[in-house]
Amino acid sequence: HTVELNDMFGQIQSPGYPDSYPSDSEVTWNITVPDGFRIKLYFMHFNLESSYLCEYDYVKVETEDQVLATFCGRETTDTEQTPGQEVVLSPGSFMSITFRSDFSNEERFTGFDAHYMAVDVDECKEREDEELSCDHYCHNYIGGYYCSCRFGYILHTDNRTCRVECSDNLFTQRTGVITSPDFPNPYPKSSECLYTIELEEGFMVNLQFEDIFDIEDHPEVPCPYDYIKIKVGPKVLGPFCGEKAPEPINTQSHSVLILFHSDNSGENRGWRLSYRAAGNECPELQPPVHGKIEPSQAKYSFKDQVLISCDTGYKVLKDNVEMDTFQIECLKDGTWSNKIPTCKIVDCRAPGELEHGLVTFSTRNNLTTYKSEIRYSCQEPYYKMLNNITGIYTCSAQGVWMNKVLGRSLPTCLPECGQPSRSLPSLVKRIIGGRNAEPGLFPWQALIVVEDTSRVPNDKWFGSGALLSESWILTAAHVLRSQRRDTTVIPVSKEHVTVYLGLHDVRDKSGAVNSSAARVVLHPDFNIQNYNHDIALVQLQEPVPLGPHVMPVCLPRLEPEGPSPHMLGLVAGWGISNPNVTVDEIISSGTRTLSDVLQYVKLPVVPHAECKTSYESRSGNYSVTENMFCAGYYEGGKDTCLGDSGGAFVILDDLSQRWVVQGLVSWGGPEECGSKQVYGVYTKVSNYVDWVWEQMGSPQGRAPGGTVS
């Protein structure tokens, strides 16, 4: 009888074991285990009747189509075999064991005790057949195996071969190289590769296969396994395979499809080709005069581009438009896209106007072309060039006027300060007891008229100031303070301020420059009680043009000492010029200034201690601070007075020979102006140089037109 066994392990014994087996007995055990396993059989006990070639009793082990072993007897002889320690291994997942005893046994034989178990098949080691083995990597597991592929490859649906995804290769460059995947290593199996060369219409693709060419072929049938086909429009070239590369192919088309097919077997190195686009040739080119063509080639064909540029100092001129370079292209019909342009010398054109300056041409005929030269200069003596640069500009290759120091920036003409066009005389009378100033003696002198029209009747007063630059006037804070305030300091509205410059006689304002105010800036610490920090600035609405009667005064160096005692200074103003004018007469004079023609006086600086003492001895709370200095004579008779307020007390600087504003007319004692031992008190400007520059938004210490250097 037959016994079917399906377990992964088991025991098989002869009938009646361990007693002797019966005669004339036949049993078959069919063992089946899952795929991926084989069966291992071994015997723990074996005792059968001996016979020649195991004719009587035997155990036969077989598969479906093969006898693996036949055992009998008790020990192995020449003609019979016992299993002993031997293990029987099935090639597959099936094993059949048959026990047979004949009709007679002369002795008692105990039979056999056998064991079996399912053991894993290592397919990765055992599968040598290319048709069954993994293409790249094999992975064994208990009961089976699986395949995987190298990076960049995809497992085929046969779960064994490795193919590549290569159906989407587009080539649009005019030249290129195309190879089989992994070239020069063997190409992948089971792959369908598609390479498209797609160029612009007008090009023709030429294909050239290289030396190494190895595609699986067949001795009789043309390319049945692997092959290349080349499709040009409706026409198909190929298939190509074997070891001989095809001849160069001139496709006569701008669009080519290359098809490469590989089956699931073979180890071949593949192929490599280069392609090149050919196009119609264009005529030879001649570079323009003063120019060049790049790249310079013997021949130019369709789609070749050339760049036309000019020598330094020249510009490409095309259709009246100047440019740095011009590009033309060879068209598919063999003509150039444009004519060769000309090279025109760079023209910097008329140089820019320099504020307060002029330009002269160094080159003949006032040429403004490349390498031409011009010179800027300032309107002397009223303006001077900043940083004393040469002012020479050359027409550059870029078409701009260039200076070695400033580059393309124009120079700056700064106002000259403290240098009147008319020299100030050394012997001077006084404002009190008066001496008329000649026009141009005090070109920085400003008349400041304040008319507060917001009150009815209008408030109107005036003071003096000093021009510091084209846009700024220095004056005393009390001149620009709203008069209707008791102790608070509020500046007057800018709308109520008018500044006159270049004024000599107040009855004739026609020759003067009058300007409204853009800003009124009082020193933030101005104290109405003691006139400390009595300094202010007016920014003019428009910059004033400088000339013989309008020029700035210089600011002093930043020095707390201020002017030295006994130094002589000059002050000018339109204030009271007669010490005998009474208050009633002042009032009755209305809003007119009190001296028609500008007056001036020469006064010595008074030692600080002397001035302080002179005021402390008076009744009343007079305070001469470190921000003030005094000037005048002990015996009186010479002084500044009402209406001169804010005017500049100027001293000639020995080093620079420029006039410097050291003081601003600020205040004086209760007695009449010019009284004995009544010194005029002036704001010490040198204490405020930083503040002044800060308000004017200018760098400190720049000369000319600024601080004495």
Epitope: D459, R485, I586
Partner: antibody, heavy 113, light 112 residues
């Protein structure tokens, strides 16, 4: 002609606010200060403050600073004086004045419970 | 604040006679910059708004009869009606014009 015309008389309860208007005509409204002066029945004149309509700048008498607000509407050439937290002693005629020389007709404000 | 003291409180003058009103300031009202005394005189008739007579202590407002004159400087000021007329019966106020502005207490002028 040049004139200042004020709004009509008002009766208010203590603690309330009053807003008196003053409409200017005949001159450049924005450029002149408008002062406010009040006069209690049978009493003298008391300066309350001023406003420059063009800039909105104001000056207030310290006595009224916390309770009075001056505003100007340049589109209608009108100045307003608002007095809050009214008390019976605020009963007075309120005048607007163009910088001393031109006076409005006055507005009587009566504060009574 | 500047205090303005007016005297007398009331004044009775015969028609055609001179009337003098004084005003004293607690601070100097002369401004050396504008050369002005910031003092004004006002007339207020019963039931009417005040009217400007004199500004800058001595300048007569246009349309004001020349019998009205102002004088003084600094802290002491005077309003003079040289020949009193019946229509001059009113209360007269002085005012200083430094912010905050202040008025005098007023002087009542009547006909004797």
């Amino acid at each position: 002609q040049v004139q200042l015309v004020q709004s009509g008389a008002e009766v208010k309860k203590p603690g309330a606010s009053v807003k008196v208007s003053c409409k200017a005509s005949g001159y450049t409204f924005t450029g002149k200060w408008i002062e406010w002066v009040r006069q209690a029945p049978g009493q003298g004149l008391e300066w309350m403050g001023e406003i420059l309509p063009g800039s909105g700048s104001t000056d207030y008498n310290e006595r009224f600073k916390d309770r009075v607000t001056f505003t100007a509407d340049t589109s209608t050439s009108t100045v307003y004086m608002e007095l809050s937290s009214l008390r019976s002693e605020d009963t007075a005629v309120y005048y607007c004045v163009r910088s001393e020389d031109l006076w409005g007709q006055g507005t009587l404000v009566t504060v009574s419970s | 604040d500047i205090v303005m003291t007016q005297s007398p409180d009331s004044l009775a003058v015969s028609l055609g006679e001179r009337a003098t009103i004084n005003c004293k300031s607690s601070q100097n009202l002369f401004n050396s910059r504008t050369r002005k005394n910031y003092l004004a005189w006002f007339q207020q008739k019963p039931g009417q708004s005040p009217k400007l007579l004199i500004y800058w202590a001595s300048t007569r407002e246009s349309g004001v009869p020349d019998r009205f004159s102002g004088s003084g400087s600094g802290t002491d000021f005077t309003l003079t009606i040289s020949s009193l007329q019946a229509e001059d019966v009113a209360v007269y106020y002085c005012k200083q014009s430094y912010i905050p502005f202040t008025f005098g207490g007023g002087t009542k002028v009547e006909i004797k």
